[in-house]
């Protein structure tokens, strides 16, 4: 039960995270005009990965796409790439994890296959989350660098009669959405990996049940004993101290449970 909950929760958290990564990637407010020096601007500038926008005090908003590919900064291209890789990996991870969910039965798919799929999707979510966090962090670093450069220009470049206002940009809402979404995807991925560890023993457990059910000489063993997972070299029975562990007696009492999981 705990494994199913962990897997389900991991899936939901990752789903929210990936939705957030997609939202962040599409958002226009990756960087917003810093209003510290000019709080009474009638024109508010903000920029995204795909276009830059202006919101006038008249209420009118206009956006212009970046219609060049070669003319864009390499860092911006890198951020775009990281976010897209994150989305693609996350989407594939979601697809894989749907079929890996214990609560969904697809033909005669064995639990070992589900465990592998859970692990695969978990790793995909972790990489997806890391891509998003990396992308957002690279953009944030770019903003900080540009901010201080433009601040220096603002106070040193005033020789001459005409002052040219430089628009300084600061962190936009998309950065925070991206960081949170990346974190959630990462957490979801870790949860899926944890769930995978719990899925494999139950698969072996299930086989043990079908073997013992035919005989009548099974002794009652108190405590939560389970057969070895087969992943380690130790093939002896180990006591598993987790809240979700069942005795072999319990497992035998309800073999029908596994037919519907």
């Amino acid at each position: 039960m705990a494994v199913t909950a962990c897997q389900g929760l991991g899936f939901v958290v990752s789903l929210i995270g990936i939705a957030g990564i997609i939202a962040a990637t599409c958002m226009d407010q990756w960087s917003t005009q810093d209003l510290y020096n000019n709080p009474v601007t009638a024109v508010f500038n903000y920029q995204g990965l795909w276009r830059s926008c202006v919101r006038e005090s008249s209420g009118f908003t206009e956006c212009r796409g970046y219609f060049t590919l070669l003319g864009l900064p390499a860092m911006l291209q890198a951020v775009r790439a990281l976010m897209i890789v994150g989305i693609v990996l996350g989407a594939i991870g979601l697809l894989v994890s749907i079929f890996a969910l214990k609560c969904i039965r697809i033909g005669s798919m064995e639990d070992s296959a589900k465990a592998n799929m859970t692990l695969t999707s978990g790793i995909m979510f972790i990489v997806s989350g890391l891509c998003a966090i990396a992308g957002v962090s690279v953009f944030a670093n770019m903003l900080v660098t540009n901010f201080w450069m433009s601040t220096a220009n603002m106070y040193t470049g005033m020789g001459g009669m005409v002052q040219t206002v430089q628009t300084r940009y600061t962190f936009g809402a998309a950065l925070f959405v991206g960081w949170v979404a990346g974190g959630l995807t990462l957490i979801g991925g870790v949860m899926m990996c944890i769930a995978c560890r719990g899925l494999a023993p139950e698969e072996t457990n299930y086989k043990a049940v079908s073997y013992h059910a035919s005989g009548h000489s099974v002794a009652y063993k108190p405590g939560g004993f389970k057969a070895s997972t087969g992943f380690g070299s130790n093939t002896k029975n180990k006591k598993i101290y987790d809240g979700g562990a069942r005795t072999e007696d319990e497992v035998q009492s309800y073999p029908s449970k596994h037919d519907y999981v």
Epitope: A42, V43, F44, Q47, S57, S58, G59, E62, V162
Partner: antibody, heavy 117, light 113 residues
Framework: EVQLVESGGGLVQPGGSLRLSCAGS????????MSWVRQAPGKGLEWVSS???????YYLDSVKGRFTISRDNAKNTLYLQMSSLRAEDTAVYYC???????????WGQGTLVTVSS | DIVMTQSPDSLAVSLGERATINCKSS????????????LTWYQQKPGQPPKKLIY???TRESGVPDRFSGSGSGTDFTLTISSLQAEDLAVYYC?????????FGQGTKLEIK
Amino acid sequence: EVQLVESGGGLVQPGGSLRLSCAGSGITLSTYAMSWVRQAPGKGLEWVSSIISGGITYYLDSVKGRFTISRDNAKNTLYLQMSSLRAEDTAVYYCARKYHGNALDYWGQGTLVTVSS
Amino acid sequence: DIVMTQSPDSLAVSLGERATINCKSSQSLLSSGNQRNYLTWYQQKPGQPPKKLIYWASTRESGVPDRFSGSGSGTDFTLTISSLQAEDLAVYYCQSNYFYPLTFGQGTKLEIK
């Protein structure tokens, strides 16, 4: 046809108060940013105040604390409450709609405010 | 505050001739977000309210004759009337729309020579 009609102007003594109104027809004032602009006799144009979405207001430094821009959505009317009036506030006051490029595209005919003792 | 300086203060041009009015801003009016210049040109005839001619420095308002054109970027702007007509006798104002206060130039009076 869009029309803006100002009213409430007149002669007032220094230190006195006046409330100017701008009634809109063919236009819903609440959906647009609106401004007040004044023109002293024989002089140029001077922006006075603006109200934008969310009720955010902006004022010329010389009128800050003395003038208040507001609107009544139900009456489709823009107001400029003027207090502590000075001789230099004497002007024709226009209300105007702010549109693309923050430009003022529709203007009223104006109302004359004379501050004199 | 942004200071808008128009030149000349008055201009006398013959009918059918080209008239050019300049406007200089103390700060750049170019928005990095949409690459538009936040400058508007108005025409004010005696006894009338101002009328918007050009916005975004070069976009002509609908209904405005195509003899009126705006140009320039950053801090230097120009209003050009390609072939002056009698009805163009008026005072012309430029206005900064980037920062509050939304400042106007002092105006240029256009007269018929």
